[in-house]
């Protein structure tokens, strides 16, 4: 029969012969021959291959470097890479999560719209009229101004986006 020019799925062509690829988690030790099958070997410690392959070396698991603020979110296996995430208070600088930066704080006049996660930064929003934030924080939302009326008090000093209203006693009319 004619030597093949193309092979089935999960096979590869070598020396005019179709050989089985190694399954995920295993590397190639030797190609098949007319008389023998492909020889594969499982990846070793801290190594992986995540596809059917003919690689002679497995890939190293990603290292979650604590000096870059990283920690292991999911330990790798022979078929999967390690997944890193950031330490508490930090978030990834990219989708690959190769390093971390400190969560941004929202300045006075701004509140937290969305608290940061391991993969996304804090989202801030300006405090609208009727709300304020007087601290720089990665957690605090804008707080509503105090309602003087409900305390039987009057506004002595108007609030801003950074300060609360100042309430005071009602002026009593002298008889």
């Amino acid at each position: 029969p004619e030597p093949p020019t193309a092979c089935r799925e999960k096979q590869y062509l070598i020396n005019s012969q179709c050989c089985s690829l190694c399954q995920p988690g295993q590397k190639l030790v030797s190609d098949c021959t007319e008389f023998t099958e492909t020889e594969c070997l499982p990846c070793g410690e801290s190594e992986f291959l995540d596809t059917w392959n003919r690689e002679t070396h497995c890939h190293q698991h990603k290292y979650c470097d604590p000096n870059l603020g990283l920690r292991v979110q999911q330990k790798g296996t022979s078929e999967t890479d390690t997944i890193c995430t950031c330490e508490e208070g930090w978030h990834c600088t990219s989708e690959a999560c190769e390093s971390c930066v400190l969560h941004r704080s929202c300045s006075p006049g701004f509140g937290v719209k969305q608290i940061a996660t391991g993969v996304s930064d804090t989202i801030c929003e300006p405090c609208p009229v009727g709300f304020f934030s007087n601290v720089s924080s990665a957690f605090e939302k804008c707080h509503p101004w105090t309602s003087c009326e409900t305390k039987d008090l009057v506004v002595q000093q108007a609030g801003t986006n950074k300060t609360d209203v100042v309430c005071g006693p009602q002026d009593r009319l002298r008889a």
Partner: antibody, heavy 120, light 111 residues
């Protein structure tokens, strides 16, 4: 029908040598990885050694590394285990086992075993 | 490398289901989907029942099934029969230089 027949076991003194053979039939011998697995009397199973279909790649358990040698002769459909510097703890039934296709860490057919006794 | 941990014995009545656990580490069961199970009747050679965690070789009854969660593999036998009474061994590839390790074995008694 797949058949594996071990031979070569027996009584040997500590420090002595033995060569086990496993005659295979009923399948294309060179297409399968092969292993030796042993079982001490009344104990569990222990993987000993394996070889790929070509015989080029060989693998050993730490407990036998440097003392045992696995080999195969594909023209004779035979697997071998040369055992040197034998110790009392090597006493066991030695099984020849066929690897499931090229995966020598699965054993889909086993021989009936040959008993190796290491004693003075 | 120490053996995988299996219960020494389990028992069940005919028709029941039983599960045998096999606990390893992140270096063996947890790292590889290369777990197999063997049945051994007294005085006989072992027989492959499950490979690659949950695959059954042809000729093995579908009453036998395998699974894995984290570092523990399990063999479940449903519709227990008298002929299932035997020793069962789990096995896994390992990152250690020993390559392959077995569990200590579980004696299954059908009451």
């Amino acid at each position: 029908e797949v058949q594996l027949l071990e031979s070569g076991g027996g009584l040997v003194q500590p420090g002595g040598s033995l060569r086990l053979s496993c005659a295979a039939s009923g399948f294309t011998f060179s297409r399968n990885a092969m292993s030796w697995v042993r079982q001490a009397p009344g104990k569990g199973l222990e993987w000993v050694s394996a070889t790929g279909g070509s015989g080029i790649s060989t693998y050993y358990a730490d407990s036998v590394k440097g003392r045992f040698t696995i080999s195969r002769d594909n023209s004779k459909n035979t697997l071998y285990l040369q055992m040197n510097s034998l110790r009392a703890e090597d006493t066991a039934v030695y099984y020849c086992a066929r690897g499931y296709s090229n995966s020598w860490w699965y054993f889909d057919y086993w021989g009936q075993g040959t008993l190796v006794t290491v004693s003075s | 490398q120490s053996a995988l941990t299996q219960p020494a014995s389990v028992s069940g009545s005919p028709g029941q289901s039983i599960t045998i656990s096999c606990t390893g580490t992140s270096s063996d069961v947890g790292n590889y989907n290369l777990v197999s199970w063997y049945q051994q009747h007294p005085g006989k050679a072992p027989k492959l029942m499950i490979f690659e965690v949950n695959q059954r070789p042809s000729g093995v009854s579908n009453r036998f099934s395998g699974s894995k969660s984290g570092t523990t593999a399990s063999l479940t036998i449903s519709g227990l029969q008298a002929a299932d009474e035997a020793d069962y061994f789990c096995c896994s590839y390992t990152t250690s230089s020993t390559y392959v390790i077995f569990g200590g074995g579980t004696k299954l008694t059908v009451l």
